[in-house]
């Protein structure tokens, strides 16, 4: 029951996280114009991974896509790639995890197969979450670097005149959405991996019970030794079974009132 709950919760948390990563990737507010000490108040600019938007004092808002690929910073391209990889991995993870859910029966799927699928989806969610967190963090670092460069340029330049970027940008809402979503996807992935351990079928332990005809002299050999009649070749208590496979005889058993020898 706890395993099913952990798996189900992991799935739901990851689902919310991936929805958040998709939302963040599509949002236009990755960076917003810093209004502090900016004399230009007629326009407010905010930018996403795909386009830039301007809201004018009249209330009119216009957005334009970044139609050039070569003119864009490599860091922006890297962030785009990380977010897309995160979404793709997350989507595949969701698909796999749906079939892995313990509460859903598909044909005669073994528990071991479900455990493997749960682990696979969990790892995918973890990588997806890490991609999103990395992407957002790279973008945030780019903004911080640009902010301080812009601040420095405000007080330098030819003849004290600003010669470079005067508009400074600060963190937009999409960054926080991305961080939270990436974290949720990561947590969901960890929960799936934990659930996988509980799903894996454990080897059944049977008490070794031997029934023999009363006419023979029977020796009870506990601790993984084959019960012997005393006439066989195993009179020196040698282990019958070698290798990794465990048999019911190999599971240590102690005599109880139900053991008849």
């Amino acid at each position: 029951m706890a395993v099913t709950a952990c798996q189900g919760l992991g799935f739901v948390v990851s689902l919310i996280g991936i929805a958040g990563i998709i939302a963040a990737t599509c949002m236009d507010q990755w960076s917003t114009q810093d209004l502090y000490n900016n004399p230009v108040t007629a326009v407010f600019n905010y930018q996403g991974l795909w386009r830039s938007c301007v809201r004018e004092s009249s209330g009119f808002t216009e957005c334009r896509g970044y139609f050039t690929l070569l003119g864009l910073p490599a860091m922006l391209q890297a962030v785009r790639a990380l977010m897309i990889v995160g979404i793709v991995l997350g989507a595949i993870g969701l698909l796999v995890s749906i079939f892995a859910l313990k509460c859903i029966r598909i044909g005669s799927m073994e528990d071991s197969a479900k455990a493997n699928m749960t682990l696979t989806s969990g790892i995918m969610f973890i990588v997806s979450g890490l991609c999103a967190i990395a992407g957002v963090s790279v973008f945030a670092n780019m903004l911080v670097t640009n902010f301080w460069m812009s601040t420095a340029n405000m007080y330098t330049g030819m003849g004290g005149m600003v010669q470079t970027v005067q508009t400074r940008y600060t963190f937009g809402a999409a960054l926080f959405v991305g961080w939270v979503a990436g974290g949720l996807t990561l947590i969901g992935g960890v929960m799936m991996c934990i659930a996988c351990r509980g799903l894996a079928p454990e080897e059944t332990n049977y008490k070794a019970v031997s029934y023999h005809a009363s006419g023979h002299s029977v020796a009870y050999k506990p601790g993984g030794f084959k019960a012997s009649t005393g006439f066989g070749s195993n009179t020196k208590n040698k282990k019958i079974y070698d290798g990794g496979a465990r048999t019911e005889d190999e599971v240590q058993s102690y005599p109880s009132k139900h053991d008849y020898v």
Epitope: S52, F60, E62, Q163, T167
Partner: nanobody, 118 residues
Framework: QVQLVESGGGLVQAGGSLRLSCAAS????????MGWWRQAPGSQRELVAI???????QYGDSVKGRFTISRDNAKNTVYLQMASLKPEDTAVYYC????????????WGQGTQVTVSL
């Protein structure tokens, strides 16, 4: 690369008028503003007026009611009509194009001197 060419500066008497123009050549990102800034000797840069690609206009407090900015999007040109000039309007006037592509870009002209005498 965007190039800005300013013209129209010069010497004028107080109360007189001047018209500055600035033509931008090259590829400019669709979202932008074009405008004028000025800097008097020993002073900081000051906003004179800007005109955005969407049609919004903003004036600096010291020139409101006296200066008029206009923009011709087809020619990528911005004009500044200066009237009722005062000696304190004496400064180097810089044309500026700011584009709102990724993290913004600023382009500046070389500046044109405007001197207002009494």
């Amino acid at each position: 690369q965007v190039q800005l060419v300013e013209s129209g500066g010069g010497l004028v008497q107080a109360g007189g008028s001047l018209r500055l123009s600035c033509a931008a050549s090259g590829s400019i990102f669709g979202l932008n503003f074009m405008g004028w800034w000025r800097q008097a000797p020993g002073s900081q840069r000051e906003l004179v007026a800007i005109a955005t690609s969407g049609g919004s206009i903003q004036y600096g407090d010291s020139v409101k009611g006296r200066f008029t900015i206009s923009r011709d999007n087809a020619k990528n040109t911005v004009y500044l009509q200066m009237a009722s000039l005062k000696p304190e309007d004496t400064a180097v006037y810089y044309c500026n194009v700011h584009t709102y592509d990724f993290l913004g870009r600023d382009y500046w002209g070389q500046g044109t001197q405007v001197t207002v005498s009494l």
